[in-house]
């Protein structure tokens, strides 16, 4: 029973007041004429956090977000009126909500906003060096934002800007019906997914986009989109949501005769995050909310962390599932989904798969095609009618690494930090919720690396009022976490070792990989430090073995709360 394990009770539960009083949170409470601090871009080099919001773009100092610069980028009164005339809400919709904020080159960012239901993009100058202290809008250079930013501020864009080209998953029309994955900017003709074909995309909600190399040859690079969408008829009885991972080759330039200016290498697969139910029916967490890629050593094989919630209004729950890219690739090399038979059900395609296999990038690695425009007609025809894979991607260990079903909140965001501790490396998850709290959770391997135990270290309230956490970034350099919501932004340190108490036992029992007992206090653990006196036991949290200071007695309550 995952959700009710003893480790699901937080070691520390800190209210907003306690966070403030202990100097563990810095907040930017927003401007009177702005809101929706949802679009984050972290720049560790410049030590800045760029944030897109309503009618504004901010540049926050990573050391202290109280120190910031701002650009005001509203819409003209005419655009605002036009939007109002279209029956939209003047405050919530008829403004410029920034949805895309990406590094364009060494000196500029690229930003796109809803433009009061008239998407617009521009460049922001940030200078060559941090000391230039430049942060200004290129007023002379505005571009059409269609296919880059949604019209409707309620919708998200998943975007990625690489080599001067913008990949974006968004809604490309006023009504919010024409969802597509686009590639714009750059020197090539814009490319998109097939229009009005529910087999490709079926009312999707895009979460994020990531470039993941396939091999050492950059020609094989793929862009992966994470999204959720309506299950296609026949795939599921009744209306259901499915979480998806989609792939596109970076060097896809569309077809020659068919799929002209459309992706020829687009494939998608379902992401499963479920637990076995008591009656043999699995409980599915299908509403993908956020994704975090943990890159470690090998950029080709990041670990994918996904945050999911249930679709049901009756049963509310959240889960975190982990996926390996080798499992993802195996599914994309597996059978395609095919509609056949008297009931028009989805079955694995059994026929001949054309060569080169649809979804393969044109490169020297996998065959002699230089461009997708050279692909044979049968490959293009097959690709157009078979965008989905039959097999789903199952999570590592075939189950979530964390579940919450007995609480009045749901998970919304996740970032993960890999921490060196005395007894190995640990992944620490910071999970944002829809009530403005952040959970700090450590994954502890049991017998094998695949078998993980989740320990809930802290539950922190980071906003004064309950508000949905809509963005999170983690700075390893600053050892800080940055959190966005409609109301504002919060900054907090990744660790609060001193709060764990004044004795070795308490420090050990905390099982926080960031913290160790140094002989006199619970403080930040640095693996490079030579001190042999550091006491820490993340795997077992056993003070008896590690603490010899006599400070154990009466301090063994594992669920010590600070209220």
């Amino acid at each position: 029973n995952y959700q009710n394990g003893k480790n699901n009770v937080p070691r520390l539960k800190l209210s907003y007041k306690e966070m403030l009083e202990s100097n563990n949170v810095i907040t930017f409470n927003g401007l009177a004429n702005s809101s929706s601090y949802h679009t984050f871009l972290l720049d560790e080099e410049r030590s800045r956090l760029y944030v897109g919001a309503k009618d504004h773009i901010f540049s926050f100092n990573l050391v202290n977000i109280k120190d910031f610069q701002k650009i005001v980028w509203p819409v003209s009164y005419t655009r605002r009126d036009e939007c109002k005339w279209a029956g939209k809400d003047i405050l919530k919709e008829c403004a410029n909500f920034i949805k895309v904020l990406k590094a364009y080159n060494q000196t500029h960012l690229y930003a796109c906003g809803t433009g009061a239901f008239h998407p617009i993009c521009t460049y922001i100058e940030i200078g060559h060096h941090p000391e230039d202290n430049i942060f200004k809008l290129e007023n002379s250079h505005f571009e059409n934002g269609r296919g880059k930013s949604p019209y409707d501020p309620k919708l998200l864009t998943a975007s990625l800007l690489i080599d001067g080209e913008l990949y974006s998953g968004t809604a490309a029309d006023f009504m919010g019906r024409d969802f597509a994955i686009f590639r714009t900017l750059g020197h090539h003709h814009p490319i998109r997914t097939e229009q009005h074909d529910s087999r490709w995309l079926n009312d999707p909600r895009f979460i994020s986009a990531h470039l993941i190399p396939e091999s050492d040859n950059p020609e094989d690079d793929k862009v992966y989109f994470f999204f959720r969408e309506n299950a296609i008829d026949g795939e599921h009885s009744g209306k259901a949501t499915h979480a998806r991972i989609g792939q596109i080759c970076k060097n896809d330039f569309g077809g020659h005769r068919s799929l002209v200016n459309k992706w020829t290498t687009f494939l998608k697969a379902r992401l499963i995050c479920s637990v076995p139910g008591p009656n043999g029916i699995d409980t599915h967490f299908d509403e993908l909310q956020d994704v975090f890629l943990m890159n470690f050593k090998d950029p080709k094989n990041p670990i994918v962390y996904g945050v999911f919630t249930t679709s049901s209004n009756i049963f509310k729950g959240s889960a975190v599932c982990m996926y390996s890219m080798s499992d993802v690739r195996r599914v994309f090399l597996g059978p395609y989904a095919h509609r056949d038979g008297p009931n028009y059900q989805w079955v694995p395609y059994q026929g001949r798969v054309p060569y080169p296999r649809p979804g393969t990038c044109p490169s020297k690695t996998f065959g002699g095609f230089d461009s997708t425009k050279d692909l044979p007609d049968d490959v293009i025809t097959f690709a157009r009618s078979h965008p989905a894979m039959y097999n789903p991607v199952f999570p590592i260990n075939n189950r979530p690494i964390m579940i919450k079903t007995d609480v009045n909140y749901q998970f919304t965001q996740i970032v993960v930090d890999r921490v060196d501790a005395e007894d190995g490396q640990y992944d620490v998850m910071f999970i944002g919720t829809d009530v403005g709290t952040v959970l700090k959770v450590v994954s502890i391997p049991k017998e094998t690396w695949h078998d993980l135990e989740e320990v809930l270290l802290e539950e922190m309230t980071v906003f004064r009022e309950p508000t949905t956490i809509s963005a999170m970034e983690l700075s390893t350099k600053q050892q800080q976490l940055y959190i966005g919501s409609t109301a504002g932004i919060a900054q907090l340190p990744l660790h609060r070792c001193d709060i764990y108490g004044k004795a070795c036992a308490e420090c050990c029992l905390a099982r926080d990989p960031y913290c160790a007992w140094d002989g006199s206090s619970c403080s930040r653990y640095f693996p490079t430090a030579k001190a042999r006196t550091r006491a820490q036991d993340i795997r077992n949290g056993d003070p008896l073995t590690h603490c010899s200071d006599g400070g154990i007695e009466g301090r063994m309550d594992h669920h010590h709360h600070h209220h």
């Epitope: 009126d81 036009e82 109002k84 279209a86 239901f117 008239h118 029309d173 009504m175």
Partner: antibody
């Protein structure tokens, strides 16, 4: 210089149909909402319909709803008004206007006469 | 009958100052920008004032607009003979979901 040139007006019987066109130049047509406004002989101005810059949304005055259809072709920089089931009270000069929070540029108008 | 109410006519002698009023409600003038249009005899209307009080380039500063509550007014100072025209006020009406005009005011320059 912004120019709007209407065409397609003329004499039509009650219940008949007519299609008005408006050719635009001198501005980025695809960036702006467009509208039709009419003026009955010797009377004041009456807004008829408007269309979003990308055709994403269309709006009509109650007096023409269900009978008139506004459309545009951004590749041709042209605005259209398809008028069906015409009535005597639809007799007017029809102006095409560029929308910019108000009607900042107007065409010279085309006369539509509906005779019974 | 027009949603916005204007006097049917107004007059003045050259050099004089003339004011034309436009009365509406909270669903139009009260919560939306007012524009004024000039229609010279036999020509198409032309935008004179936008966003209550702003003049497009090329419009002389003799023309000014103002708004208070649910009423707006157009003032023309230093009246000239070429100002003889029909003047219309207009605004978006939130409850009707449409643009509404006043019935128009015929301005006559005497003498």
């Amino acid at each position: 210089e912004v120019q709007l040139l209407e065409s397609g007006g003329g004499l039509v019987q009650t219940g008949g149909s007519l299609r008005l066109s408006c050719a635009a130049s001198g501005f980025t047509f695809s960036d702006y909402a467009m509208s039709w406004v009419r003026q009955a002989p010797g009377k004041g101005l009456e807004w008829v319909s408007w269309i979003y810059y990308d055709s994403g949304s269309k709006y009509y005055a109650d007096s023409v709803k269900g009978r008139f259809t506004i459309s545009r072709d951004n590749s041709k920089n042209t605005l259209y008004l398809q008028m069906n089931s015409l009535r005597a009270e639809d007799t007017a000069v029809y102006y095409c206007a560029k929308l910019n929070g108000d009607f900042d540029y107007w065409g010279q108008g085309t006369l539509v006469t509906v005779s019974s | 009958q027009s949603v916005l109410t204007q006097p049917p006519s107004a007059s003045g002698t050259p050099g004089q100052r003339v004011t034309i009023s436009c009365s509406g409600s909270s669903s139009n003038i009260g919560n939306n920008d007012v524009s004024w249009y000039q229609q010279l005899p036999g020509t198409a209307p032309k935008l004179l004032i936008y966003a209550d009080s702003h003049r497009p380039s090329g419009v002389p500063d003799r023309f000014s607009g103002s708004k208070s509550g649910t009423s707006a007014s157009l003032a023309i100072s230093g009246l000239r003979s070429e100002d003889e025209a029909d003047y219309y006020c207009g605004a978006w009406d939130s409850s009707l979901s449409g643009y509404v005009f006043g019935g128009g005011t015929k301005l006559t320059v005497l003498g």
